[in-house]
């Protein structure tokens, strides 16, 4: 049995998969911040783990996935204000008892040390300093990304 | 480049709906949040509320109770009721682009609306 | 009554500058780096000036500069042009997710 939470974050992640392939991302759009291969947008406003992911996939990316403590540091540097949380794209599954990416893959739990408690209707916030779980309900800022796509030079058969 | 067009009634009666549609054209409806804002004649400017292209919306305190937004992303509209209008209600209207929920990058021309009988 | 406090006229002759001043509380303008500014020429739409305390949208002249100091924004515009004559709108986003303006300056190019 699925909470609510885990069917909104695998329902918008399997319409995102449906949508038709839009052309690769080459520059940031305006207001968002490139960070190496991908463009973050931090949300000024505030909003439930819920809203936020819907927030995300309307703005045609996804709540922030860290792939590692390197990208972790990189991102909070980002963040200039050092008392201001951020949801990112991760959760607590009841199902399997562990954090889940919303890309379905689970957290290593080297990469990031979480202050708070692992259980249901947790969710995942960062700060200029560290990383925390949170109630899904707490209505605090978020951050989306979509990524660049890798510019490769085409090459034309001769005409 | 981006405009908006604010459209609806110029006039309403007191204690009827007030519905405005804003038309959004050469650019995404769906990056965005939309508000509407409106300015008394010779006043200044009150925010009335933003939607997001999700749904969800925020609304001015003071005028939360009479307020209902919408979108319709497929036709690239937005659209504002206000109900219970009084003669306190006539204003220009203008609708924005909201990009962060914070500022207006892009406004309509703005449409008048008045409550009178 | 506006929620932010700005004075009702401003001038100055071309050339010169001219700060206009925006006045909150902790809750808006001291409480966020999310302070606009708007331009509104006679019955034109208003027009973004400024963006978080001191961002220029591109097309906006250098002339126009923002900053902040605790509960007050200001706006300066310097080397006056007989065009900057309007009505300037401080705004600011404030606790949960509201937005509030100012009442606004009338700006008199001498």
């Known amino acids: 049995q699925k909470s609510s939470i885990e069917k909104c974050s695998v329902d918008i992640q399997q319409s995102r998969n449906k949508t038709t392939e839009r052309p690769g991302l080459l520059n940031c759009p305006i207001y968002w911040q490139q960070l190496r291969e991908k463009c973050l947008l931090f949300s000024h406003t505030v909003n439930p783990w819920n809203n936020s992911l819907a927030d995300c996939s309307t703005k045609e990316s996804s709540l922030l996935l860290i792939r590692d403590k390197d990208e972790l540091i990189h991102t909070q540097n980002l963040i200039r204000d050092k008392a201001i949380l951020f949801w990112i794209g991760l959760n607590f599954s009841l199902s399997e008892k562990n954090w889940k990416w919303i890309n379905g893959s689970f957290l290593n739990s080297n990469d990031l040390e979480i202050r708070g408690d692992a259980k249901e209707n947790s969710c995942i916030s960062i700060s200029q300093t560290s990383v925390y779980s949170e109630y899904c309900s707490t209505e605090i800022r978020w951050i989306c990304q979509k990524e660049l796509t890798p510019v490769r030079n085409k090459v034309y058969p001769d005409s | 480049q981006v405009q908006l067009q604010e459209s609806g009634p110029g006039l309403v009666k007191p204690s009827e709906t007030l519905s405005l549609t804003c038309t959004v054209s050469?650019?995404?409806?769906?990056?965005?949040?939309w508000s509407w804002i409106r300015q008394p004649a010779g006043k200044g400017l009150e925010w009335i509320g933003r939607?997001?292209?999700?749904?969800?919306?925020n609304y001015n305190p003071s005028l939360k109770s009479r307020v209902t937004m919408s979108v319709d992303t497929s036709k690239k509209q937005f659209s504002l009721k206000l109900s219970s209008v009084t003669a306190a209600d006539t204003a220009v209207y203008y609708c924005?682009?909201?990009?962060?929920?914070?500022?207006?990058?892009?406004w309509g021309q703005g449409t008048l609306v008045t409550v009178s009988s | 009554q506006s929620a932010l406090t700005q004075p009702p006229s401003a001038s100055g002759s071309p050339g010169q500058s001219v700060t206009i001043s925006c006045t909150g509380t902790?809750?808006?303008?001291?409480?966020?780096?999310?302070v606009s500014w708007y331009q509104q020429h006679p019955g034109k739409a208003p027009k973004l000036m400024i963006y978080?305390?001191?961002k220029r949208p591109s097309g906006v002249p250098d002339r126009f500069s923002g900053s902040k100091s605790g509960n007050t924004a200001s706006l300066t515009v310097s080397g006056l042009q007989a065009e900057d004559e309007a009505d300037y709108y401080c705004?600011?986003?404030?606790?949960?997710?509201?937005?509030?303006f100012g009442g606004g300056t009338k700006l008199t190019v001498l």
């Open positions: 924005a682009r909201d990009p962060l929920g914070t500022f207006f990058d892009y």
């Open positions: 050469g650019g995404s409806i769906s990056n965005y949040y």
């Open positions: 939607i997001y292209t999700s749904g969800s919306n």
């Open positions: 902790s809750s808006d303008v001291g409480g966020y780096n999310y």
């Open positions: 978080e305390v001191s």
């Open positions: 705004s600011s986003y404030a606790d949960t997710n509201n937005v509030v």
